[in-house]
C-alpha cells in the first residue's frame, strides 16, 4: 500500500535534526575592524564630518573574534531559531585552494569555516561539513582544475584528496560528520556530451571520494573519530502504469542508473551494478549506443569497496517513469526512461511532486540492497512561493517525516538523521529556504521546531525528554576545551 495511516512515536535521542545549506562563501576579512584599530579619533561632527586621528594616543585592541564576521552572526541567529542539533554546510574548494593544490592555501577562508563550526558548537549545534558541492550553474572547482577538463581528468581526484586532507587537518577536531561530495550522480547534467564523458567523470568522482575516505581512515580517524560518506541524489521511482511490466523494469532501472551506479561500488562490490553494465552493453551490441561503463581494475575495486561510514541520501520527490527506447550515446538515452508528470499530485512551483511514501520505499530499498547500515537523509525539502506562511513546506515536512518515522519504527531502518533543505533561499532561485534571501523567518520554522522538540509525533502522554548521558557530557566538555585551546 502506498499511503498508510500516520503513526505516533518518536525518533531516538541521538537522532540528528538538521538543516542544510549549500556552499558558504567565506568572508575574506572580518567585517568589524573597529576593534583592531588602536587609534583614537575625534569626529568633526559639525564641520567636515570626518574622523581625525588623535596623534600619540594608542588604545588597547581586542583580539579578532569569530562573530566579527557579519554573515556568521546572521547564520547563528537563523540556526538558533531553527533549534536544530546539526548544521550541514559546504566549503568552497575554489576559495580554500585557488590554485587547486597546496601551494597556495587560503588560511583566512579556513579560519572563517572554523569559526562557523566553533560558534555553532557554542549553541549546541554540530556541523556536518561537505567538502565539495557542485551545482549546475557553478562547478565549484579551482580554475586550474576546471581548465584541465575538471572531472574528466583523473588528476582532479588526486587534487581532491589533497584538499580533503587539508580540511580534515584544519577542521577535523571539531567536525565529526563529513560528506566528501554532494550528489556526484547529478554531475551527469554537466558531463553530458556523451555517455562516456558521464561515466568517465563519475569514475573519477568515485575515486576522489575513495581516496579521501582512505586518507581519513588511515591518518585522521584514530584521533578525530569522525565518519565520512558522500551524499547521493536519491529520488524514488514508481512505474507510471503499475500494470505494465516494462514500467516496473524502468523504475528499477532508474534506481540502478541513479543510485546503484555510485552505491554499488562503494557500499558493496567495488564495481558498477551488473544490471547497469549489462543494459548499456546490450544497447551497444545492438548499435543503439556507443557508451560503455569503465572497466575497473582489481586495484580500483579494492580502492572503492567499503569506503563509506554511513549512507547519505538527498531525497526530494518520487518520479513516475515508463520505458521508452531511445537511440543516442548519452547517459539520458542509455537509460531508456521517460518521465511522466502526474498532474493530479500536489506539486511545487518547480513541479516537484509531494509523494511522502516514496521516502519510506527508498529507505527500504536501500536496506534491502546494501544491508543494515546507518542512514542519514542529508537534504530533503520543497520550494514554496510563500514568503511567510509556507504551508506547502509545513505539509511536506510533516508528511515526509511521518514516512521516515514509519521506516524507523515499523521497518526498523537505522535512520540516524534528517536534514531539511535549506536554511536560507537565494535571490531569484526556487524558494527552498526556511528564511527568505533577506533573512526573514517563515512559519515552517515553528513547525519544524515543534517536531524537533517532540522528537517526532509522540503520544499525548509520552515524554520528549532525553536523559543527558555521561558520555554526552564528557563530549561537550571536550569540545569546550578544544575551543578554549590557544
Amino acid at each position: 500500500k502506498e499511503s498508510t495511516p500516520d503513526v505516533q512515536g518518536q525518533f531516538p535521542c541521538d537522532f540528528s535534526w538538521g538543516v542544510t545549506e549549500s556552499v558558504l562563501k567565506p568572508e575574506s576579512v572580518a567585517s568589524s575592524p573597529q576593534f583592531s584599530d588602536p587609534h583614537l579619533y575625534v569626529w568633526n561632527a559639525t564641520g567636515n564630518r570626518l574622523l581625525h586621528r588623535v596623534e600619540g594616543v594608542r588604545l588597547k585592541t581586542r583580539p579578532a573574534q569569530c562573530t566579527d564576521f557579519v554573515n556568521i552572526k546572521k547564520q547563528l541567529e537563523m540556526l538558533a531559531r531553527m533549534k536544530v542539533t546539526h548544521y550541514r554546510f559546504a566549503l568552497d574548494w575554489a576559495s580554500v585552494l585557488p590554485t587547486g593544490n597546496l601551494s597556495a592555501v587560503n588560511r583566512q577562508a579556513l579560519r572563517y569555516y572554523r569559526c562557523v563550526v566553533s560558534e555553532g558548537l557554542k549553541l549546541g549545534i554540530s556541523a556536518m561539513v561537505t567538502l565539495y558541492y557542485p551545482t549546475h550553474a557553478h562547478l565549484g572547482l579551482p580554475e586550474p582544475l576546471l581548465h584541465a577538463d575538471g572531472w574528466l581528468n583523473p588528476s582532479t581526484a588526486e587534487a581532491f584528496q589533497a584538499y580533503a586532507g587539508l580540511c580534515f587537518q584544519e577542521l577535523g577536531d571539531l567536525v565529526k560528520l563529513w560528506i566528501t561530495i554532494n550528489e556526484p550522480n547529478r554531475l551527469s547534467d554537466i558531463y553530458n556530451r556523451s555517455g562516456n564523458d558521464t561515466y568517465g567523470a563519475a569514475h573519477n568522482l568515485l575515486v576522489a571520494h575513495a581516496l579521501a575516505w582512505r586518507l581519513y581512515d588511515r591518518q585522521f580517524r584514530p584521533s578525530q573519530r569522525g565518519a565520512v560518506s558522500l551524499s547521493l541524489h536519491a529520488d524514488w521511482a514508481e512505474p507510471a502504469n503499475p500494470y505494465a511490466d516494462s514500467h516496473w523494469r524502468a523504475a528499477e532501472r532508474f534506481l540502478q542508473f541513479e543510485i546503484a551506479w555510485f552505491a554499488e561500488p562503494l557500499f558493496k562490490t567495488g564495481d558498477y551494478p551488473a544490471a547497469m553494465r549489462e543494459y548499456i552493453a546490450s544497447k551497444h551490441r545492438r548499435g543503439l549506443s556507443s557508451s560503455a561503463l569503465p572497466r575497473l581494475t582489481e586495484a580500483e575495486r579494492r580502492l572503492l569497496k567499503g569506503t563509506v561510514d554511513f549512507c547519505a541520501l538527498n531525497h526530494f520527490t518520487t518520479r513516475f517513469v515508463m520505458h521508452e527506447q531511445l537511440a543516442g550515446s548519452r547517459y539520458d538515452s542509455d537509460r531508456d526512461i521517460q518521465f511522466l508528470q502526474d498532474i493530479t499530485r500536489l506539486s511545487s512551483p518547480t513541479r516537484l511532486a509531494v509523494i511522502p511514501w516514496g521516502v519510506r520505499k527508498l529507505l527500504r530499498w536501500v536496506r534491502r540492497n546494501y544491508g543494515d547500515m546507518d542512514i542519514y537523509i542529508t537534504a530533503s525539502g520543497i520550494d514554496d512561493q510563500a514568503l511567510e506562511d509556507d504551508r506547502l513546506r509545513k505539509y511536506y515536512l510533516g508528511k515526509y517525516l511521518q514516512e521516515v518515522l514509519k521506516a524507523y519504527l515499523i521497518d526498523k531502518v537505522r535512520i540516524k538523521g534528517y536534514y531539511a533543505f535549506k536554511l536560507a533561499e537565494e535571490k531569484s532561485k526556487p524558494r527552498f529556504g526556511f528564511f527568505t534571501s533577506d533573512f526573514k523567518a517563515k512559519s515552517s520554522i515553528q513547525f519544524y521546531n515543534k517536531v524537533i522538540s517532540s522528537r517526532g509525533f509522540p503520544f499525548e502522554n509520552s515524554s520528549s525528554r532525553c536523559s543527558q548521558t555521561q558520555e554526552n557530557t564528557e563530549c561537550t566538555v571536550c569540545l569546550f576545551l578544544v575551543q578554549k585551546k590557544p
Epitope: E143, L146, D149, S194
Partner: antibody
Framework: QVQLQQSGDELMKPGASVKISCKVT????????IEWVKQRPGHGLEWIGE????????KYVEKFKVKATFTADTSSNTAYMQLSSLTSEDSAVYYC?????????????WGQGTLVTVSA | DIVMTQSQKFMSTSVGDRVSVTCKAS??????VAWYQQKAGQSPKPLIY???YRFSGVPDRFTGSGSGTEFTLTISNVQSEDLAEYFC?????????FGGGTKLEIK
C-alpha cells in the same frame, strides 16, 4: 597525448572551394569543440568558429557565416572546414585547435596549420 | 564583439631584462584571458590561462596578471628563445577574440 593533424597546403584559383581536414587523436573526439582560426600576415589571429563533432552543433563568427562550413566525421575522428568562393582575402594559414571541456575558447592543442594560397 | 587591443606591435628587449606586454578588452571579460606564444613558422602555444595561471611546462619567468579589462603578460629574465609574437585572447564570450599581437625582438 592529444594531437591534431591537418591536411597539406593548398594552391587554389579564385572562385573555387577548398576543404581542410583536421584529424584528432588521443581524446574523445565527439566531446570537445574543435575551433578554427585564420592567420594572415600582419592581421594576427582571427577566430572563425567552432563545431562540436558529436552533435554537429556549430557556431560561426558573423563575417564567416557564408564563407566557412564546418563538418565532422566521428567514425574517423576528423573535422573539416570548407571555404567557398575563394578570393585573395582568403589567402592565409588556417589552424584547427581543440578547446578545454569547460572552456572551449581556451585553445590548448593546435594543428600545424594549413596554408591556403588563392591565386589566378 | 569584444575587441582586444595590444597597443604595442613591437617591443625590443635584451636577454636578462624584464618586459611587460599589455592587452585591453573593450568590455569586462572577468579573468577569462589567455596568452599564446607564436614563434616564426610554428603554431601558437598556450602560455597563460585565466589571466594568471601558467600552463603546464611553461617556465615561471612568464607571469600573467589583471582582470576585468586590463591584462599584462610579464617576462622576467628574458631569454633568447623568447623571441616570438605574443597574443592575448578573451574566451569569456563567443566570438572568442584575439589581440593584434606583440612581437618581441631581442637586441
Amino acid at each position: 597525448q592529444v594531437q591534431l593533424q591537418q591536411s597539406g597546403d593548398e594552391l587554389m584559383k579564385p572562385g573555387a572551394s577548398v576543404k581542410i581536414s583536421c584529424k584528432v587523436t588521443g581524446n574523445t573526439f565527439s566531446s570537445y569543440w574543435i575551433e578554427w582560426v585564420k592567420q594572415r600576415p600582419g592581421h594576427g589571429l582571427e577566430w572563425i568558429g567552432e563545431i562540436l563533432p558529436g552533435s554537429d552543433s556549430t557556431k560561426y563568427v558573423e563575417k564567416f557565416k557564408v564563407k566557412a562550413t564546418f563538418t565532422a566525421d566521428t567514425s574517423s575522428n576528423t573535422a573539416y572546414m570548407q571555404l567557398s568562393s575563394l578570393t585573395s582575402e582568403d589567402s592565409a594559414v588556417y589552424y584547427c585547435a581543440r578547446g578545454g571541456y569547460h572552456y572551449p575558447g581556451w585553445l590548448v592543442y593546435w594543428g600545424q596549420g594549413t596554408l591556403v594560397t588563392v591565386s589566378a | 564583439d569584444i575587441v582586444m587591443t595590444q597597443s604595442q606591435k613591437f617591443m625590443s628587449t635584451s636577454v636578462g631584462d624584464r618586459v611587460s606586454v599589455t592587452c585591453k578588452a573593450s568590455q569586462n571579460v572577468d579573468s577569462y584571458v589567455a596568452w599564446y606564444q607564436q614563434k616564426a613558422g610554428q603554431s601558437p602555444k598556450p602560455l597563460i590561462y585565466s589571466a594568471s595561471y601558467r600552463f603546464s611546462g611553461v617556465p615561471d619567468r612568464f607571469t600573467g596578471s589583471g582582470s576585468g579589462t586590463e591584462f599584462t603578460l610579464t617576462i622576467s629574465n628574458v631569454q633568447s628563445e623568447d623571441l616570438a609574437e605574443y597574443f592575448c585572447q578573451q574566451y569569456n564570450i563567443s566570438p572568442y577574440t584575439f589581440g593584434g599581437g606583440t612581437k618581441l625582438e631581442i637586441k
